[in-house]
Amino acid sequence: EEELQMIQPEKLLLVTVGKTATLHCTVTSLLPVGPVLWFRGVGPGRELIYNQKEGHFPRVTTVSDLTKRNNMDFSIRISSITPADVGTYYCVKFRKGSPENVEFKSGPGTEMALGAKPS
């Protein structure tokens, strides 16, 4: 089996208030089975940004169709950026487990920061 890698190509993403930000994440393998989630920050206080399998995230859309059985692109778009959205975003692969899924591998993170205001 090819070992799964989480690829977040941008270390830094400069965004503009009011605009939409795209956070990229691809995986190199579909296995082990389990969902991909997005978080801001690390540790027990990290904030869930998007959960592939459940939940309502009105400002978040996926770049690709996650219902494709061979999908390896878990990039997301966050709309209507505000200063409160700055931080480091991680895409995280979980492997299935009972009763809870188990964190398997995290991407290196993308820091979202505010760029210059539009003129």
């Epitope: 089996e1 579909l30 296995l31 082990p32 089975v33 969902p35 592939q52 399998k53 459940e54 169709d65 996650l66 219902t67 494709k68 059985r69 061979n70 299935k96 009972s98 009763p99």
Partner: antibody, heavy 118, light 107 residues
Framework: DVQLVDSGGGVVRPGESLRLSCAAS????????MSWVRQAPGKGLEWLAG????????YYIDSVKGRFTISRDNSKNSLYLQMNSLTAEDTAVYYC???????????WGLGTLVTVSS | ALTQPASVSANPGETVKITCSGG??????YGWYQQKSPGSAPVTVI????KRPSDIPSRFSGSASGSAATLTITGVRVEDEAVYFC???????????FGAGTTLTVL
């Protein structure tokens, strides 16, 4: 409430074609992958085909690849199964099913009976 | 191929376990589907190994470990008489498969 209503079944002769439909309501159809599953008389369930939410990706079991085509029209909240070159072995109740995020099934249609007989 | 027993029986109130083997834990998710009569619409009682839809009674539970999944009915009732099919999705092949079905008889 989620509702899936299968239709289009009937009696056909070997070699003929049939198009099944599944009308969906009670959920955002365009957000879900869908599948067709059949059950031959006295037999178990057999998955036939699946389609992604956007309709661009399709998947088939080997025994129907090239004969059956799954498609969808998200503007009509409808799923289809075009079945060509039918044989007696295709006689079954055909169900549409909504897929979960990991391609299992959470809701099923009531089924439509297809009989292939000379 | 998924393997499950052809039949199981129990008295009302007993606990019933139906096993399904043949999948690879690393690449497989399991579901369980109840069919009360041939040709009637299946009802999903468990998906994603252990997730119970909100309209399914709590006496139904699921688990998976190694190459097998288990459906447990705790305090079985007469209305639970049905054929139970295990199903699996294999992330390696992108294919869904089903077991042959287990007939549950409540004595």
């Amino acid at each position: 409430d989620v509702q899936l209503v299968d239709s289009g079944g009937g009696v056909v002769r070997p070699g003929e074609s049939l198009r099944l439909s599944c009308a969906a309501s009670g959920f955002t159809f365009s957000s879900y992958a869908m599948s067709w599953v059949r059950q031959a008389p006295g037999k178990g369930l057999e998955w036939l085909a699946g389609i992604s939410a956007g309709g661009s990706d399709t998947y088939y079991i080997d025994s129907v690849k090239g004969r059956f085509t799954i498609s969808r029209d998200n503007s009509k909240n409808s799923l289809y199964l075009q079945m060509n070159s039918l044989t007696a072995e295709d006689t079954a109740v055909y169900y549409c099913a909504r897929e979960t995020w990991n391609h299992l099934f959470d809701y099923w249609g009531l089924g439509t009976l297809v009989t292939v007989s000379s | 191929a998924l393997t499950q027993p052809a039949s199981v029986s129990a008295n009302p109130g007993e606990t019933v376990k139906i096993t399904c083997s043949g999948g690879d834990y690393y690449s497989t998710y399991y579901g369980w589907y109840q069919q009360k009569s041939p040709g009637s619409a299946p009802v999903t009682v468990i998906h994603s190994d252990d997730k119970r839809p909100s309209d399914i009674p709590s006496r139904f539970s699921g688990s998976a470990s190694g190459s097998a999944a288990t459906l447990t009915i705790t305090g079985v009732r007469v209305e639970d008489e049905a054929v139970y099919f295990c199903g699996a999705y294999d992330g390696r092949t992108y294919i869904n498969t089903f077991g042959a079905g287990t007939t549950l008889t409540v004595l």
